[in-house]
């Protein structure tokens, strides 16, 4: 079965998480994409999504999350600005492909946010600046609700080196109205996805 891997990001409060999810294939370019948080034993929750169809280089903002889809490079850029300790947790990008279940992208992102200022790299933005300048053309997009009769797969156990996710709900303004419960793709499902096994080793997150 395909191993679900994680990439760890350790940042300070006020900094910006800036990552790119790699979707590689052209057939996914216009598909709606989403940024989700995964809590142990729960279905992933969608925090933000692109428009449907996804527009090229067109930022979508939901609270402190900004998504930008770059069709020409097969990359979904995800920024979470003004990070808070409560944002710590496990995240993933998915591609919606109804009526099929969403296609999960590698790797998952393990975000650890700690208190206190640090000048260390980890953000493209000025760490001292808590107010992020949102591009003027950003729009909001509603995320679809998918229901599935299939059972939910347990999220993989966190390593002892990882910081556990706080019990409190993630502190993202204007996001609760579009949060949707989302099924996690099982490892068996992944093997039957549109990307064949012979290609999977090329599709790791950078």
């Amino acid at each position: 079965a395909t191993k679900l891997t994680e990439e760890k990001y350790e940042l300070k409060e006020g900094q910006t998480l800036d990552v790119a999810c790699d979707y590689t294939l052209e057939k996914f370019a216009s598909s709606q994409k989403a940024w989700q948080i995964i809590r142990d034993g729960e279905m992933p929750k969608t925090l933000a999504c692109t428009e449907r169809p996804s527009k090229n280089s067109h930022p979508v903002q939901v609270g402190r999350i900004i998504l930008e889809d770059y069709h020409d490079h097969g990359l979904l850029r995800v920024r979470m600005v003004n990070l808070q300790v409560e944002d710590s947790g496990l995240y993933q990008c998915v591609i919606y492909q109804p009526p099929k279940e969403p296609h999960m992208l590698f790797d998952r992102i393990r975000l650890v946010v700690t208190k206190g200022f640090s000048g260390t790299p980890g953000s493209n933005e000025n760490s001292t600046q808590n107010v992020y300048k949102i591009p003027p053309t950003t729009t909001k997009a509603l995320c679809p609700l998918y229901t599935s009769p299939r059972t939910v797969t347990q999220a993989p156990p966190k390593s002892t080196a990882d910081v556990s996710t706080p019990d409190s709900e993630i502190n993202l303004t204007n996001v609760t109205d579009i949060i949707r419960e989302q099924k996690l793709i099982s490892e068996e499902d992944l093997e039957q996805k549109l990307i064949s096994e012979e290609d999977l080793h090329h599709h790791h997150h950078h």
Partner: antibody
């Protein structure tokens, strides 16, 4: 196993035309962009152009040296990519390779063995 | 067009020694944290073979004595301990922008 097999090479006079084919197998052909790369004897590699997938409206891109003379096409039902070469010049003499990338702007993981095109009078 | 310049043009290294090939781009080949720069090995009479993709990722089946590094405009291919079968021409290639381009190649020989 992914396989790419080029055919159609040969001797042609300057100003003439030739059409190369690249027969693909072992993968879902329609999912990937296909490229042509050439190499003159004893020289380096030169990217010729690429054709994207149906979801990108089969968009094509070319190196400046062949633009307007060469045309890349594909037939997904036949798992085949083509390189139509017109107004051939002696400097087009090379081994022409068909390659498959690993996705949008990704690396060339698979190559054919190449077919030799000789432009000479 | 992005011009890739490899150095040196040719290189002679003793067996077991380290070989280093550089590739400089005329402009950045990065998009976000991704470098769209790849390395290939070509032996006489054969098509090129992918070694390293996106600057630092080792292609499956390639010996781990090969490694890649760099970002932006400056990249390096390193062979940590040269083996006889590594004699070949090595090319860098960028796919960040159209037209895609290759470096001119570096010929690696045994000293």
């Amino acid at each position: 196993e992914v396989q790419l097999v080029e055919s159609g090479g040969g001797l042609v006079q300057p100003g003439g035309s030739l059409k190369l084919s690249c027969a693909a197998s072992g993968f879902t052909f329609s999912t990937y962009a296909m490229h042509w790369v050439r190499q003159a004897s004893g020289k380096g590699l030169e990217w010729v152009g690429r054709i994207r997938t149906k979801s990108s409206n089969y968009a094509t891109y070319y190196a400046a040296s062949v633009k307007g003379r060469f045309t890349i096409s594909r037939d997904d039902s036949k798992n085949t990519a083509y390189l139509q070469m017109n107004s051939l010049k002696t400097e087009d003499t090379a081994v022409y390779y068909c390659t498959r990338d690993m996705g949008i702007r990704r690396q060339f993981a698979y190559w054919g063995q190449g077919t030799l095109v000789t432009v000479s009078s | 067009d992005i011009v890739l310049t490899q150095s040196p043009d040719s290189l002679a290294v003793s067996l077991g020694e380290r070989a280093t090939i550089n590739c400089r781009a005329s402009e950045s080949v990065d998009t976000f944290d991704y470098s769209f720069l790849h390395w290939y090995q070509q032996k006489p009479g054969q098509p090129p073979k992918l070694l390293i993709y996106r600057a630092s990722n080792l292609e499956s089946g390639v010996p781990d004595r090969f490694s890649g590094s760099g970002s932006g405009t400056d990249f390096t291919l390193t062979i940590s301990s040269l083996q006889a079968e590594d004699v070949a021409v090595y090319y860098c290639q960028q796919s960040n922008e159209d037209p895609y381009t290759f470096g001119q190649g570096t010929k690696l020989e045994i000293k």
